[in-house]
Every structure is written in structure tokens, then in C-alpha cells.
């Protein structure tokens, strides 16, 4: 058993049918010695008396808010949560496996640049009685500071019969140098509590591996005289690290017909312009990627050929 | 990814082309190592990230773009002195910092070159003959060093009398390639920045 926060405790259980569970001793936080009784949640049934209460925690029915009283007055509370260990592996019931970029990916994180700011998000089908708390650091043995905000519900989607909820959090490394070569990964830890179930999820990454630039901005077309060709131009996104000559991007320019089946013409360039043939009803899209370290491509910025 | 390779203009900063080749070569070598050593811990998540140049050179700090010198987190000032007569500086008015930067890059390359050559000698003794260093990568390191053209004492190749542990050598190769790829990215950024200024 360990303390998650004041008066909230997590009982770790080897979770299998007929398991013996864990013996837990609760102590009433009071100078009183006599006439103390204990109850669980809203029930008025007295579970025991005395300054301490010994319970065998086996299942969720044994978890909840234990309260010690004296003469009708509440003295203190202890909330017991359960953390299930199933065959040596901590349960992951609360969050959905996003399966990207690999199986067992519960937290996904992205950064728009090298400033040390990043966003993580996760999915669940649970709509109520759910709380999250996020902590982060650079490295784990001698951790350096990363400050995270509160997790917020950022999207709701309908997936088949189920509703899916996306939560996200923004974090900022306290003293980040955009040019630094990372040798210790960022660690992100999310505590999830659903009713009386506790779970924790972690992700470990280097900022350089989660970079996904914003799409190029100011995408414009300039027709070339007496030609079907157009000059496409764009700019670096505002959120990208500066100076751009140091944090350079490379670009992919795509000409796509109306039909998805039509052949796509693609050109790669390090410049912020390109000359392409504009077909009728086609659209031109441009996306960006770090020129020197191949992390994710940005989303496409698009303009119609007409 | 297969991107068209830009050939440098004659007036272009002489080292940019070499640094682009270097990054391409080390990335290819790392990919090859990951595939060949699939049963070894060779991914970024599995290896310890060690920097053999730590406390010996200060490339990131010495080559910091002017715009980032206002960022206190980037000014991890380390006193390091280097020789300053590189040919990449030809026909350009350069500051002491720029010379310091390029000589720091040269020292990095020299250190990695020694490590890679020592390691290759061990790998050549492996009866499994599973993996060797790409000669192209070693040649590209050499070309960039020549382009930088700094006078520096030659570091003797490390020789080891004990029987090599091939498993450890291969893991060390992965660690070294990951670190060198990160340094090659920094070098490329620096060359691109200097070329633009």
C-alpha cells in the first residue's frame, strides 16, 4: 500500500480468482483513543472499533472511503483504491491502446518544434468518475524539471456503438535549449483513477523523435506565362524553431487530382517554392519535415489548382 | 527517404556538401545495423545514449547560432581551446567562435574515426562476420575532415590485447552510431547555418 495523495491510498493486488488479497491496517488520524468506530462509503454498518482497523482487501467491494467516527462526528477519511497486477503486468483497463506507432501505445506525444514544449494525448471510452494527473521529467535517476498543465477533455468521437473521449495535456521543459543534443529521454507519467481503480501509464521519448511541424503557411500559386506550369510558394510555419537556416525543413509538394485513384505527382525540395504542372480540378499540397532528422511529416497545406 | 540530392554551387560553403553526405552515410549505416542486429538491443529505446565527445569537445555550445545565445539554457559555457586555421573558412571573415566551432567539429570527427576504426578491426575478427562498418561512411568522415583541414595531433588507433567480446562490440557499435547520427545532424545544421550567413 502506498499514498497517492493526502488520505488516498493505493493497494496493489495480485489479481486472480480466489487470491488472498492484501491485509491493510488503517489508522484514524485523531488524538482520540476510545469510542472510535469505522464505516465504509455511505453505509452505516460498523466495520470495527478502535483507533486502527485491519481489513483484508481482495476485491473492489473492499475498496472505497473508510471513515472513522466518534459520537456522530467524522474524525478522518482514508480512500482506498485498487491497482490490479494481472500475471505480473499492471492492468490497462482505463485507456485505449492506440496501436500507433506500435501496440501497447496508450500515450501519444508530439512537439511542433525544439523549444521543449510538447503535447500528449490519450483515449478512453469512460465518460464519468474519471480523473487524471500528469507528471513529467527529463531522465528518471536524476530528473530535471518539466512542468505539465492539467489534463483536459480535448475531443469526443463516436466509434461504432461507443463514444471515445480524448484527453490531452501540455508540458514544457523548464530549461530547454532547442539546439541541445538529447541524451536523456523525457518521461511522462499519467495517473488514472476510474471509480476505485488506479492505473498508471508512462511514455519515454526524445523531443527529436516526436517532432511534427505545423503545415507550411501562406501556400500560394503563381501561374507561369504561356505554360500549364505554376510556381508554388510557401513559408515556414510560425511555430517552427528559429533560425530557419539552422532548423531547416524539407518539403514534399504533391499534385492530386479530384479522384483519389489518380496518380499523384510528388516533388521533394529544400526550397520554399517549386514549379509543378497544375491539372484541371487538381489540388496542390505541401507538407514539411525536419530536413536532417526524419521524424513525422506535418499535415498537408492545400490549395486548389483553379 | 529518397530525396533529390542538391549539388553544391561552386561558391557554396565548402563543407556543406560533405556534411550532407556524412549524415546520409551514418543514417544508412545505422539502419543497416538495426536490421542486421535485430536480435541485439540496437534501437533508440533500448540503448544507453553515450557521447564519447562529452567533456572533450563542445560542438553544440561552440556552434550555437547567434539567435540562440540569448537563451540561457543554451549557454552551458565550457572552456575549450582549439587550433583555428581551417580551410572551410577560406575567403570569409570569420569570428573566433566560428573557428572554434569548426575545430570542435573536426575533433568530434577525429574521435569517432578512431573509435570506428578500432571497432571495425574487432568486427573483422568475428567468426560470424555479421556486420562491418561501411567503408563509404569512413571515407565520408575522412573527406569532411580534409575539408575542415585543421592541424591536429594524430590520435593513435586503440589496440586491445584481450579477446574481443563480439556481443559487447556490436552493442557498442549501436551506441556509437546513434550518438554519431545525432552529432551528424548537429554538424549539418551548423553547416547549413554558416552557409546561409
Amino acid at each position: 500500500i502506498w499514498e497517492l495523495k493526502k488520505d488516498v491510498y493505493v493497494v496493489e493486488l495480485d489479481w486472480y480468482p480466489d487470491a488472498p488479497g492484501e491485509m491493510v491496517v488503517l489508522t484514524c488520524d485523531t488524538p482520540e483513543e476510545d469510542g472510535i468506530t469505522w464505516t465504509l462509503d455511505q453505509s452505516s454498518e460498523v466495520l470495527g472499533s478502535g483507533k486502527t482497523l485491519t481489513i483484508q482487501v481482495k476485491e473492489f467491494g473492499d475498496a472505497g472511503q473508510y471513515t472513522c467516527h466518534k459520537g456522530g462526528e467524522v474524525l478522518s477519511h482514508s480512500l482506498l483504491l485498487l491497482h490490479k497486477k494481472e500475471d505480473g503486468i499492471w492492468s490497462t483497463d482505463i485507456l485505449k491502446d492506440q496501436k500507433e506507432p506500435k501496440n501497447k501505445t496508450f500515450l501519444r506525444c508530439e512537439a511542433k518544434n525544439y523549444s521543449g514544449r510538447f503535447t500528449c494525448w490519450w483515449l478512453t471510452t469512460i465518460s464519468t468518475d474519471l480523473t487524471f494527473s500528469v507528471k513529467s521529467s527529463r531522465g528518471s535517476s536524476d530528473p530535471q524539471g518539466v512542468t505539465c498543465g492539467a489534463a483536459t477533455l480535448s475531443a469526443e468521437r463516436v466509434r461504432g456503438d461507443n463514444k471515445e473521449y480524448e484527453y490531452s495535456v501540455e508540458c514544457q521543459e523548464d530549461s530547454a535549449c532547442p539546439a541541445a543534443e538529447e541524451s536523456l529521454p523525457i518521461e511522462v507519467m499519467v495517473d488514472a483513477v476510474h471509480k476505485l481503480k488506479y492505473e498508471n501509464y508512462t511514455s519515454s521519448f526524445f523531443i527529436r523523435d516526436i517532432i511534427k511541424p505545423d503545415p507550411p503557411k501562406n501556400l500560394q500559386l503563381k501561374p507561369l506565362k504561356n505554360s500549364r506550369q505554376v510556381e508554388v510558394s510557401w513559408e515556414y510555419p510560425d511555430t517552427w524553431s528559429t533560425p530557419h537556416s539552422y532548423f531547416s525543413l524539407t518539403f514534399c509538394v504533391q499534385v492530386q487530382g479530384k479522384s483519389k485513384r489518380e496518380k499523384k505527382d510528388r516533388v521533394f525540395t529544400d526550397k520554399t517554392s517549386a514549379t509543378v504542372i497544375c491539372r484541371k480540378n487538381a489540388s496542390i499540397s505541401v507538407r514539411a519535415q525536419d530536413r536532417y532528422y526524419s521524424s513525422s511529416w506535418s499535415e498537408w497545406a492545400s490549395v486548389p489548382c483553379s | 527517404r529518397n530525396l533529390p540530392v542538391a549539388t553544391p554551387d561552386p561558391g557554396m560553403f565548402p563543407c556543406l556538401h560533405h556534411s550532407q553526405n556524412l549524415l546520409r552515410a551514418v543514417s544508412n549505416m545505422l539502419q543497416k545495423a538495426r536490421q542486421t542486429l535485430e536480435f541485439y538491443p540496437c534501437t533508440s529505446e533500448e540503448i544507453d545514449h553515450e557521447d564519447i565527445t562529452k567533456d572533450k569537445t563542445s560542438t553544440v555550445e561552440a556552434c550555437l547560432p547567434l539567435e540562440l545565445t540569448k537563451n540561457e539554457s543554451c549557454l552551458n559555457s565550457r572552456e575549450t581551446s582549439f587550433i583555428t586555421n581551417g580551410s572551410c573558412l577560406a575567403s570569409r571573415k570569420t569570428s573566433f567562435m566560428m573557428a572554434l566551432c569548426l575545430s570542435s567539429i573536426y575533433e568530434d570527427l577525429k574521435m569517432y574515426q578512431v573509435e570506428f576504426k578500432t571497432m571495425n578491426a574487432k568486427l573483422l575478427m568475428d567468426p560470424k562476420r555479421q556486420i562491418f562498418l561501411d567503408q563509404n561512411m569512413l571515407a565520408v568522415i575522412d573527406e569532411l575532415m580534409q575539408a575542415l583541414n585543421f592541424n591536429s595531433e594524430t590520435v593513435p588507433q586503440k589496440s586491445s590485447l584481450e579477446e574481443p567480446d563480439f556481443y559487447k562490440t556490436k552493442i557498442k557499435l549501436c551506441i556509437l552510431l546513434h550518438a554519431f547520427r545525432i552529432r551528424a545532424v548537429t554538424i549539418d545544421r551548423v553547416m547549413s547555418y554558416l552557409n546561409a550567413s
Epitope: Y16, D18, D87, I89 | -
Partner: antibody, heavy 115, light 112 residues
Framework: QVQLVQSGGGVVQPGRSLRLSCAAS????????MHWVRQAPGKGLEWVAF????????YYADSVKGRFTISRDNSKNTLYLQMKSLRAEDTAVYYC????????WGQGTMVTVSS | SYVLTQPPSVSGTPGQRVTISCSGG????????VKWYQQLPGTAPKLLIY???ARPSGVPDRFSGSKSGTSASLAITGVQAEDEADYYC????????????FGTGTKVTVLG
């Protein structure tokens, strides 16, 4: 004590269907994940499928994906395996088992796919 | 389809020490715990070892398990006639959990 009693096995022609059941008692069935494991005659153990305690997630071996469906009825304390498009290579003893560090197995039920 | 490799058979005379190996990889045994089962002919498997080296109550202490790196082993010290059975190791793969990964199985023969 914990008990898993299996039923539903038998002889079936290739291409036909069969449903296996596993009735649980002696524990809170709705709190635990469940597996199906099979063993072809004279061969080793092969995992078939898993279902979460609440039925929200199901996992299958590649060899049965798209043909077999694992399900549970927590109100009846019963686990099921619906097997469709059966093949000769599905011939085996099928076991249900609880998920956890200490597990309990059903007695097994024989499924023979033969023409 | 078996990722955990066991020797097909091992044998020993009563009282001898018999060991069975189970060889896997970094993503399975290297990252997860190992179980061992005993299966007597015509019966369901019986759990002998869980969590690499822990014995459930009722399992004789002549059975012991261990794990090192990407391999695990089961030892029977002072093998007895009633130990003649098939033995299976089991683990998980970190990418496909909760799918069970079973070993190829080992037939233990007690001679004499």
C-alpha cells in the same frame, strides 16, 4: 472453490459451426479476464483467444481471426467460443482458463472436425 | 508459430536433477514473467511455477524456476516417477499481450 465446467464439444464437418461454453463458479466471474487455449492431438498448447473482464476488448490468434468469436455473459457467469468455418486443423481439446498469476483451467472439451 | 523453444525431451533416473530450458527473446521472456505447467496424459495443464520462480501452494519444493535474460529454466531436483509428464513454459510478448506464448513442450521421462 473456483470451478470451470466446459461443454459443447463434438464432431463437426469442415465448414460448419460449433459453440463451446465454460460455466464459472466459486469466484466473481465478472472481475477477471478469460482465455481459450487448445491442444491438437499429440501436439503442444496453443493460445486461441482472450476477453477482458467486461467484454470490452477481445484478442485472437492469427490462426482463428475472423472465424472464431469469444464472448461472455457476466450475468450467467459463462464464457463462450463461437467457432465458424471449421477446418480439420481446428481439431483439438479446447480449454477455458482464468487470467492471472494463479490460473484455473476447465476440464477440456474435444472438438473433432472431420468429413 | 512457437517463439519459446524447449528441448523435445529430457530424461533422468529417480533422484537425479533434471532441467528444462525455455529460450525466448527480448520482447517476451526478456520483458515478462515466465510460468511453467505440468501436463499429465489426458488432463488439463497444472501450474507449477509463476512469476519466474514462485511456487503455488501444494507444488512440491523439488520444482524450482529461474530466469536469466531471454531464457528461463525449470529444475526438478530429485525427480520421481510421478513427474513423468509434458512440461510447458509460458510468457507474453510485450507487443501482443494478453496473448499467451507457450513453449514447444518437453517430455520428461523417468528411467528405471
Amino acid at each position: 472453490q473456483v470451478q470451470l465446467v466446459q461443454s459443447g464439444g463434438g464432431v463437426v464437418q469442415p465448414g460448419r459451426s460449433l459453440r463451446l461454453s465454460c460455466a464459472a463458479s466459486g469466484f466473481t466471474f465478472s472481475s477477471y479476464g478469460m482465455h481459450w487455449v487448445r491442444q491438437a492431438p499429440g501436439k503442444g498448447l496453443e493460445w486461441v483467444a482472450f476477453i477482458r473482464y467486461d467484454g470490452s476488448n477481445k484478442y485472437y490468434a492469427d490462426s482463428v481471426k475472423g472465424r472464431f468469436t469469444i464472448s461472455r455473459d457476466n450475468s450467467k457467469n459463462t464464457l463462450y467460443l463461437q467457432m465458424k468455418s471449421l477446418r480439420a486443423e481446428d481439431t483439438a481439446v479446447y480449454y477455458c482458463k482464468t487470467h492471472g498469476s494463479h490460473d484455473n483451467w476447465g476440464q477440456g472439451t474435444m472438438v473433432t472436425v472431420s468429413s | 508459430s512457437y517463439v519459446l523453444t524447449q528441448p523435445p525431451s529430457v530424461s533422468g533416473t529417480p533422484g537425479q536433477r533434471v532441467t528444462i530450458s525455455c529460450s525466448g527473446g527480448r520482447s517476451n521472456i526478456g520483458s515478462n514473467t515466465v510460468k511453467w505447467y505440468q501436463q499429465l496424459p489426458g488432463t488439463a495443464p497444472k501450474l507449477l511455477i509463476y512469476g519466474n520462480d514462485a511456487r503455488p501452494s501444494g507444488v512440491p519444493d523439488r520444482f524450482s524456476g529461474s530466469k536469466s535474460g531471454t531464457s528461463a529454466s525449470l529444475a526438478i531436483t530429485g525427480v520421481q516417477a510421478e513427474d513423468e509428464a509434458d512440461y510447458y513454459c509460458q510468457s507474453y510478448d510485450r507487443g501482443t499481450h494478453p496473448a499467451l506464448l507457450f513453449g514447444t513442450g518437453t517430455k520428461v521421462t523417468v528411467l528405471g
